[in-house]
Interface confidence: low
């Protein structure tokens, strides 16, 4: 960012999307602003219109190509600018030389499904979405389970320190409704952060068999 009151943060999803948020105190109202992406070694450039997400912050997604296309590599640098229109001119409001594989945030895992459920345990699988083949197996996951009467924030985090796209939840209560979420993070990148949480998967454990101890 160009001054202390402005913050310009972007993340690469490892394939063909750069998501950006720009916030600025006292930013001009009713001004058209956009993010412009200018790679150092590619023939393309791309823009997206910044749309308000709060009183003083705007966001947009730079769509670089087909969702699963590998548009950038570990050696690319992309100059990202926030440009705001002032009359007939475009004024540069913020700028960064963006190293995509140092600023990763993957898409949330998808296709969560219950593989097998019992009275006290449940096996759940998922898939990662639009993740670069460069990572090979260098990914980690966090998962959490929402129990009745609790909030997501209270749910303990389960860490999977390898590319393991399933989990076996144990010590569950029979005949109880639960929800499950998972998120993913590459091991690479100084400023890399966790993906958003997946959509919650609701499941119910099987009731205990009549006449049996639980």
């Amino acid at each position: 960012a160009v001054n202390g009151t402005s913050q310009f943060t972007c993340f690469y999803n490892s394939r063909a999307n750069i998501s950006c948020v720009w916030s600025q105190d006292g930013a001009l109202q009713d001004t058209s602003c956009q993010v412009h992406a200018w790679p150092d070694r590619r023939r393309w450039n791309q823009t997206c219109e910044l749309l308000p997400v709060s009183q003083a912050s705007w966001a947009c997604n730079l769509i670089l190509g087909a969702p699963d296309s590998q548009k950038l590599t570990t050696v690319d640098i992309v100059t990202l600018r926030v440009l705001c229109r002032e009359g007939v001119r475009w004024r540069v409001m913020a700028i960064q030389d963006f190293k995509p594989f140092e600023n990763l945030r993957l898409m949330a895992p998808i296709s969560l499904q219950v593989v097998h459920v019992e009275t006290h345990r449940c096996n759940i699988s998922w898939e990662i979405s639009q993740a670069s083949h460069y990572f090979e197996r260098h990914l980690e996951f966090e998962a959490r389970t929402l129990s009745p009467g609790h909030t997501w924030e209270e749910a303990p985090l389960l860490t999977l320190k390898q590319k393991q796209e399933w989990i076996c939840l144990e010590t569950l209560t029979p005949d109880t409704q639960y929800e499950f979420q998972v998120r993913v993070k590459p091991l690479q990148g100084e400023f890399t952060t966790w993906s958003p949480w997946s959509q919650p998967l609701a499941f119910r454990t099987k009731p205990a068999a009549l006449g049996k101890d639980t």
Epitope: V2, N3, D40, T79, R89, W90, R91, V92
Partner: nanobody, 123 residues
Framework: QVQLVESGGGLVQPGGSLRLSCAAS????????MAWFRQAPGKEREFVAS????????DYVDSVKGRFTVSRDNAKNTVYLQMNNLKPEDTAVYYC????????????????WGQGTQVTVSS
């Protein structure tokens, strides 16, 4: 609005070198794409070289390619023009220019200008 002050001009023999500097003040320097122009006696002001706000991308007029190098130091709010293998036809007043619209930096009417510094190449 940014203010620009050039320095480093002078008299130099053909084949010699000079380094021009342009110090900026009054606004956030990194917002500006910077350029050097020159104007020889009786001729129109012409584009010489430009450097984008990040300093990563440069552009030159064909006649100076391989001889001149434009650069900037955003920490010092300064842009430079290193001129090597100078020729008599490089004699001109050299102007520093700034524009927040990097698509318009070659446009004479939309830039902010310094006062210029004289470069004379003569034996």
């Amino acid at each position: 609005q940014v203010q620009l002050v050039e320095s480093g001009g002078g008299l130099v023999q053909p084949g010699g070198s000079l380094r021009l500097s342009c110090a900026a003040s009054g606004d956030v320097f990194v917002r500006y794409t910077m350029a050097w122009f020159r104007q020889a006696p009786g001729k129109e002001r012409e584009f010489v070289a430009s450097v984008t706000d990040s300093g990563r991308t440069t552009d030159y007029v064909d006649s100076v390619k391989g001889r001149f190098t434009v650069s900037r130091d955003n920490a010092k709010n300064t842009v430079y023009l290193q001129m090597n293998n100078l020729k008599p036809e490089d004699t001109a007043v050299y102007y520093c220019a700034a524009n927040t619209d990097y698509f318009q930096i070659k446009s004479l009417d939309r830039n902010t200008w310094g006062q210029g510094t004289q470069v004379t190449v003569s034996s």
